[in-house]
Interface confidence: low
């Protein structure tokens, strides 16, 4: 580590004085200290010498000295105070530029460390600092105001008490500079944007940022557009606005824009689409199919999507029949929009009943006229069964007629014994219907089938059981013959309630 | 010591022009966010508008009944602020202060000239 | 932009007592992000530039004695003259710094009663 002559910390002189540093090091030494006049430097080999004959306020500051070659980078460090009457402070920056919350340190030097008690930090026009100045001061290195903030760029004087008097250095501008996060903030409104040629429009493309330092453009399909420029500072950040109005669109007008603001840090786009149509126009869509089949008591919402332009001026849902006269409640129909031009509108029907299968109409109107979307709505329902002893073409024939949607198949089942249903092990013989006669099959209703079982000689001791079933469920009847007459019934478990 | 001196008002014609100066000294002008208020006589203050720092930008503001008629500049060089007033109606009679605020202090005003009269009458 | 409405239009009080000068504003002037008001109220005196002394609020300026303080947060604030002097007879006004255009109240003259 290299020695300094005088071998002091500090070293108090008066102006004009004569000082002489010296420096000794093993191998070469070379000095470090403020920028100062009337310094002469002399080197010879592992020393070197730092003189002057007329010190001043000036050449108050801190001397070090290193070792180049020293692989520990050793060094030592002496501090000259030159204490002027007249000139208390030794400001080495009039300009310190910091990062918010970093410190920041104002360099002005004490000429006399006597004065030390009696100093102070103030700002220029004899202002106090601001509430909540959090500083220190060393008459070293000066004042150091600790994790400073951006409100703090102020212009500083340093103020020390000489004879009863403050006497002020010659001020320091802090320039506290934002910790720009990234790129500035951009909106771009709107978001999409559809006009009829000859209308007028308007893009606004704004950019914000902590730090004024960043430049804001809007561009159309790449080109970039001249636009005036509107700046704010508001809420401590810096605000670039641009502004296109057009009083009459046409189809050049149309097409990709794009809000390009950019710093330092980078660069941030972000873009739209602008439409220009002929006329207005409206047009409905579903995700669903149009044809809906759903069991009955369940739930169904009906979802139609609409894109118009100009805005809708009227819409609603209408049953179109074919059963009751009614109408979906309002509180069912929902409306939502995606954005500015796409809307979804949703009609809830929950627990389908009998008289709600049918025809549902969403109709929409805007300047383009009226559009509609309509949905047939189809219920299921699981077989209702009913057996009957008759005689056709002088025959026994048991008739079975089935009711339900989707159409039933039908099966027939003999069995022995008595009972409501027969199970596997009675089984006798089985007969499978695959044309049963269709008697009614309308749209929006159940189908009903009938199917014939020609018996030469009722078994009273057995069962006749007709099964129906589809894709919702199944239902069956029993046909028991009885010396005294047939006698029929349903199986207790068949209930149906929708 | 700090100060703003106005000058430059006087008796103008409806649809005439003036132009106000204001001299700047005892501080860092080229700092100070610059804002001229003026206030018509037995009325209120009224903010006419504001001038940004050149380092902030060097942007101006301006009110409604104002805009397009009046131009905020100023010449750091000289310390000088001007409002170069066009158009002039009865209604912009008024003394015209120049003023700043203390930087941290964004536009509360704590610096204010003495004001400068402007009379437009036919 | 934002409207100022001071209230009373003039005060009348008896030297010694209390001064209280109302301000409302038609959006609030408090940034959240360093939770300051960006409020200020100004004297003015026949013949006289406005002299500031309250800013953020509720900050008195260097210089101002101690009897004028300002209070409220938001939209509503009060300047307070807990007793009032004869030199404090002037023409008080609030004004909000928080966006363009800076706009300031009505005024509110103080007398003695």
């Known amino acids: 580590i290299p020695v300094i002559e005088p071998s002091v910390p500090e070293l108090v002189v008066k102006p004009g004085a004569t000082v002489t540093l010296r420096c000794v090091g093993n191998g070469s030494v070379e000095w470090d200290g403020p920028p100062s006049p009337h310094w002469t430097l002399y080197s010879d080999g592992s020393s070197s010498i730092l003189s002057t004959n007329n010190a001043t306020f000036q050449n108050t500051g801190t001397y070090r000295c290193t070792e180049p070659g020293d692989p520990l980078g050793g060094s030592a460090a002496i501090h000259l105070y030159v204490k002027d009457p007249a000139r208390p402070w030794n400001v080495l920056a009039q300009e310190v530029v910091v990062f918010e919350d970093q410190d920041a340190l104002l360099p002005c030097l004490l000429t006399d460390p006597v004065l030390e008690a009696g100093v102070s930090l103030v700002r220029v026009r004899g202002r106090p600092l601001m509430r909540h100045t959090n500083y220190s001061f060393s008459p070293w290195h000066g004042f150091t105001i600790h994790r400073a903030k951006f409100i703090q760029s102020q212009d500083y004087q340093c103020s020390a008490l000489m004879g009863g008097r403050k006497v002020m250095s010659i001020s320091i501008r802090l320039k506290v500079q934002k910790v720009i996060p990234g790129p500035p903030a951009l909106t771009l409104v709107p978001a999409e944007l559809v006009r009829i040629r000859g209308e007028a429009a308007q893009i606004v493309c704004s950019a914000s940022s902590v730090d004024v330092n960043f430049d804001v453009f809007l561009q159309h399909n790449n080109t970039k557009l001249a636009i005036p420029q509107q700046s704010d500072f508001h809420n401590n950040r810096y605000q670039k606005v641009l502004t296109l109005n057009l009083d009459q669109v046409d189809f050049q007008h149309a097409g990709n824009y794009s809000c390009v603001a950019s710093n330092v840090q980078g660069k941030h786009s972000t873009s739209m689409f602008f439409r220009v149509v002929e006329s207005a126009y409206l047009n409905l869509s579903s995700e669903q199919n149009l044809i809906q089949e759903v069991t009955v008591g369940e739930g169904l919402n009906l979802k139609v999507m609409v894109e118009a332009y100009p805005g809708l001026q009227g819409f609603n849902w209408t049953y179109l029949g074919p059963f009751s006269d009614h109408q979906p409640e309002p509180k069912l129909a929902n409306a939502t929009t995606k954005d500015t031009y796409r809307h979804t509108f949703t009609l809830s029907l929950p627990r389908l009943k009998p008289s709600e299968a049918g025809r549902y109409s969403f109709l929409a109107r805007n300047p383009g006229g009226w559009r509609a979307l309509t949905f047939e709505l189809t219920l299921r329902y699981p077989p209702e069964v009913s057996v009957i002893w008759t005689f056709i073409n002088g025959s026994g024939t048991l008739l079975c007629a089935a009711s339900g949607y989707p159409q039933p198949n039908v099966t027939w089942l003999q069995c022995s014994g008595h009972t409501d249903r027969c199970d596997e092990a009675q089984v006798l013989q089985v007969w499978d219907d695959p044309y049963p006669e269709v008697l009614s099959q309308e749209p929006f209703h159940k189908v009903t089938v009938q199917s014939l079982l020609t018996v030469e000689t009722l078994e009273h001791n057995q069962t006749y059981e007709c099964r129906a079933h589809n894709s919702v469920g199944s239902g069956s009847w029993a046909f028991i013959p009885i010396s005294a007459g047939a006698h029929t019934h349903p199986p207790d478990e068949f209930l149906f309630t929708p | 010591e700090v100060q703003l001196v106005e000058s430059g008002g006087g008796l103008v014609k409806p649809g005439g022009s003036l132009r106000l100066s204001c001299a700047a000294s005892?501080?860092?002008?080229?700092?100070?966010?610059m804002s001229w208020v003026r206030q018509a006589p037995g009325k209120g203050l009224e903010w006419v508008g504001r001038?940004?720092?050149?380092?902030?930008?060097?942007?101006?503001d301006y009110a409604a009944p104002v805009k397009g008629r009046f131009t905020i500049s100023r010449d750091d060089s000289k310390n000088t602020l001007y409002l170069q007033m066009n158009s002039l109606k009865t209604e912009d009679t008024a003394v015209h202060y120049c003023?700043?605020?203390?930087?941290?202090?964004?536009?509360?005003?704590?610096?204010w000239g003495q004001g400068t009269m402007v009379t437009v009458s036919s | 932009d934002i409207v100022m409405t001071q209230s009373p239009d003039s005060l009348a009080v008896s030297l010694g007592e209390r001064a209280t000068i109302n301000c409302k504003s038609s959006?609030?002037?408090?940034?959240?992000?360093?939770?300051?008001?960006?409020l200020a109220w100004y004297q003015q005196k026949p013949g006289q530039p406005p002299k500031l002394l309250i800013f953020?609020?509720?900050t008195r300026d260097s210089g101002v004695p101690d009897r004028f303080s300002g209070s409220g947060s938001g939209t509503d604030f009060t300047l307070t003259i807990s007793s009032l002097q004869a030199e404090d007879v002037a023409v008080y006004y609030c004004?909000?710094?928080?966006?363009?255009?800076?706009?300031f109240g009505g005024g509110t003259k103080v007398e003695i009663k």
């Open positions: 003023t700043t605020g203390d930087y941290s202090y964004t536009d509360a005003f704590d610096i």
């Open positions: 005892g501080f860092t002008f080229s700092n100070a966010w």
């Open positions: 001038i940004k720092s050149k380092t902030d930008g060097g942007t101006t």
């Open positions: 959006q609030s002037v408090l940034y959240s992000s360093n939770n300051k008001n960006y």
């Open positions: 953020w609020a509720s």
């Open positions: 004004q909000q710094y928080y966006s363009t255009p800076l706009t």
